[in-house]
């Protein structure tokens, strides 16, 4: 018996199709993803194959306009509208809080969604029962396969799920619901998870009875032979894992921003058991033709997202210098600003000796495009913020060394004067650069915001010591020469929208005034 | 021990309607679906319908598909068969049975409860 | 619809002897073919499911093959409690249907 599995995982918003970068579509002859385009890919396969699931591994929310605007209910609608048929629970799902979940997603989604490892207690217990599941069986054709869901433990950390949902491991988690499973005669599991690539093949390896897992989290781009596009493979897909009770176990995952539909075909014998998997992420380029209905609804709910940019969301009454001429040379405020908002997004309270889970912020002065002007009756529209931070980026929360740090600040001033993108903007971070020293060793002195305090103050970095820090994902990536970040970074998760975690400061603020207050000198 | 009891059983006149139901413990009545078979006095068995395990599909045999409608409530362990514009051909015994296979184990099986449409 | 026939209609054999019962679809059923036993004012009693595997508490004189469009249920020695009508039972894309029954009498 053979199963096509297509799945899409950390979408993040990207209903209309996008450059090949996954930001804004400019030249639509040379666009990809998009619900649409995505609708006729899967309605293609399904006239053609008897057996088809869509599956998403979770991110639907956060990351354009579309979800500042509908909070949500762009997803359930337009994943109604693809009839997809189970969607796992991801760390963004939470970011406006559990009630930013239940009543447009959860309450609205025609599919089921899924995760056995969120256990909801207190008095959200009740208001959450069956909104959401730890399994769900599913017909196939004439047969049954069982679709057990996970979320990325780290969520607490990640976004806003309050205190009355507790993330229990997703192995620990997963093997019970697995087993009742298997005692109702499901002998067809298929693991729909959002914990990132390592956790997806641990799982593969340790919950006895997973047949298959579709993850996502980690934005992973797995491909058998030349690849389509600029996304280099993480590994073969499927990326096949050993469990430890000598099974094969396809995982996969479809990159990220609905760039590619995932397609996986498994033959399973009677018993259940997947007797072969093969397939490939088909990329959704424009030779694929958005459906034209898909295309019309699309444009019927971007009409509100055209009048939701020249909204005032807040006030400056200072002006917010973003120029490359400040931010690439010296503290901005447009960067302090940038960076207090991000401090700001991911306040977490975590526990009685912690203040927050982070305190610091870098930020490249070359990713800050535009100074506002506040001369224009201090307004501050979404609009003017796009002009601020236009590549479509991302605010990720990153771990890494004292000394991973101290080399960032390293490189941050190696070739200064250029007017180079390199120039770090900084929060939770005191430092004071030698330019008569030579490249390589003009940081003199390096403090950061203590997290383990009752009252934040500022110390010496440690080289050793390991840290939380918020930052672009451009840069989590090696961007601007920030190699030994993407090199040495001892975890990564990505984060909300850049656009969004400034316009949600600025509208929470309400009237802003930045100063430059000395977070970087020069001695 | 497993136990289904169906009741709401009866006369009715052809047009009319009436709900049946089935009284379920002794298991975990939110695993499992659930169906509707009927016999008519004398003949063979009839698949009427089925509901999956959180009500999230059903399935009808064509002979009362948009007359008949399977429901259930699992924070009352019942299963309920509403049927609308009866016939004379519905008069049968209907038997609440459990699946414990999807589809390919009906394993157990109420007493039955008997409907009879006649004017 | 898939249709099933049940041959032969009567079946009649003395308590001991060996009982052979078909049950042959209009198309392919795969494995999905169930066997009932029904006795006269009782509800029905699952025998075999999956064409072969024996339900629970159900004696090892009652045994299931075929597949495909063919199939048979066996009654190795017939006791005096086997005396029923045995029905088979399909599924194909969530749609049910029963044999019209072999009635097992005593000769």
């Known amino acids: 018996w053979e199963l096509t599995i297509l799945h899409t995982n950390d979408v993040h918003s990207r209903l209309e199709q996008t450059s090949e970068d996954s930001s804004k579509c400019v030249n639509a002859s040379r666009c990809m993803g998009g619900v649409a385009r995505l609708f006729t890919k899967v309605q293609q396969i399904r006239r053609a194959e008897p057996n088809v699931l869509l599956l998403d591994a979770g991110d639907q929310y956060q990351g354009t306009i579309w979800f500042t605007v509908y909070k949500g209910a762009e997803v359930a609608h337009f994943m109604n509208a693809l009839r997809y048929d189970a969607m796992a629970l991801g760390n963004h799902e939470f970011d406006n809080g559990v009630e930013g979940l239940i009543e447009p997603l959860l309450k609205e989604a025609k599919f089921p969604i899924l995760s056995a490892n969120i256990k909801a207690k207190g008095p959200l217990a009740s208001q959450i029962s069956g909104l959401y599941l730890p399994y769900k069986v599913l017909p196939v054709g004439d047969e049954v396969v069982g679709i057990v869901g996970y979320t990325s433990k780290e969520t607490p950390f990640l976004s806003n799920p309050g205190t009355n949902l507790v993330f229990e491991d997703e192995i620990t988690a997963l093997q019970p619901e697995v087993d009742k499973l298997k005692t109702l005669n499901v002998n067809k599991i298929i693991a729909l998870g959002h914990s990132g690539f390592e956790t997806d093949k641990l799982i593969a390896q340790k919950v006895r009875g997973v047949d298959v897992v579709v993850g996502g989290h980690s934005n992973t781009f797995l491909y058998t032979g030349n690849p389509p596009s600029k996304e280099v493979p993480a590994g073969k897909y499927p990326f096949i894992v050993t469990s430890d009770d000598g099974r094969k176990v396809p995982v996969v995952q479809a990159y990220a921003f609905g760039k590619y539909l995932g397609y996986l075909k498994i033959e399973f014998d009677e018993r259940g058991n997947v007797i072969s998997s093969h397939g490939n992420p088909i990329l959704l380029n424009s030779s694929i033709p958005e459906d034209p209905s898909i295309k019309a609804d699309i444009n019927k709910w971007r009409i509100k997202l055209d009048n939701y940019s020249t909204q005032e969301l807040g006030k400056t009454i200072v002006y917010l210098d973003g120029s490359s001429q400040s931010c690439r040379f010296r503290e901005c405020n447009m960067g302090n600003l940038i960076c207090d908002a991000m401090i700001n997004n991911n306040l977490r309270h975590a526990d009685e000796m912690f203040w927050n889970h982070v305190s610091m912020c870098i930020l490249n002065g070359g990713g800050i495009r535009s100074p506002i002007d506040e001369r224009n009756n201090g307004t501050i529209t979404w609009e003017n913020l796009a002009a601020v931070l236009p590549f479509g980026g991302t605010f990720d929360l990153v771990q890494l060394k004292g000394s991973t740090l101290k080399k960032a600040f390293e490189h941050s001033v190696h070739r200064y004067g250029q007017s180079t993108g390199e120039f770090l903007q900084v929060g939770g971070i005191h430092v004071v650069y030698d330019l008569s020293r030579k490249p390589g060793d003009r940081v003199v002195k390096l403090d950061v915001l203590c997290t383990k305090c009752r009252v934040p103050s500022y110390d010496p970095l440690k080289m050793d010591e390991i840290y939380k820090v918020i930052l672009p994902n451009f840069l989590a990536n090696g961007g601007d020469g920030f190699q030994m970040i993407k090199d040495e970074l001892l975890r990564h998760d990505s984060g909300d929208q850049d656009i969004n975690v400034v316009s949600t400061y600025i509208s929470k603020m309400k009237v802003i005034y930045p100063a430059v207050e000395g977070r970087i000198k020069f001695s | 021990q497993v136990q289904l009891v169906e009741s709401g059983g009866g006369v009715a006149q052809p047009g009319r309607s009436l709900s049946l139901s089935c009284a379920a413990s002794?298991?975990?009545?939110?695993?499992?679906?659930m169906h509707w078979v009927r016999q008519a006095p004398g003949k063979g068995l009839e698949w009427v319908a089925l509901?999956?395990?959180?009500?999230?599909?059903?399935y009808y045999a064509d002979s009362v598909k948009g007359r008949f409608s399977i429901s259930r409530d699992n924070s009352k362990n019942t299963l309920y068969l509403q049927m609308n514009s009866l016939r004379a051909e519905d008069t049968a015994v209907y038997y609440c049975?459990?699946?414990?296979?999807?589809?390919?184990?009906?394993?157990?099986w109420g007493q039955g409860t008997l409907v009879t449409v006649s004017s | 619809e898939i249709v099933l026939t049940q041959s032969p209609a009567t079946l009649s054999l003395s308590p001991g002897e060996r009982a052979t019962l078909s049950c042959r679809a209009s198309?392919?059923?795969?494995?999905?073919l169930a066997w009932y036993q029904q006795k006269p004012g009782q509800a029905p009693r699952l025998l075999i499911y999956?064409?072969?595997n024996r339900a629970t508490g159900i004696p090892a004189r009652f045994s299931g093959s075929g597949s495909g469009t063919d199939f048979t249920l066996t009654i190795s020695s017939l006791e005096p409690e086997d005396f029923a009508v045995y029905y088979c039972?399909?599924?194909?894309?969530?749609?049910?249907?029963f044999g019209p029954g072999t009635k097992v009498d005593i000769k």
């Open positions: 049975v459990r699946d414990a296979q999807w589809g390919s184990r009906l394993d157990y």
């Open positions: 002794g298991f975990t009545f939110s695993d499992y679906g």
């Open positions: 039972q399909q599924r194909s894309n969530w749609i049910f249907t």
């Open positions: 999956d064409a072969s």
């Open positions: 509901i999956w395990y959180d009500a999230s599909f059903e």
């Open positions: 198309q392919s059923v795969s494995r999905y």
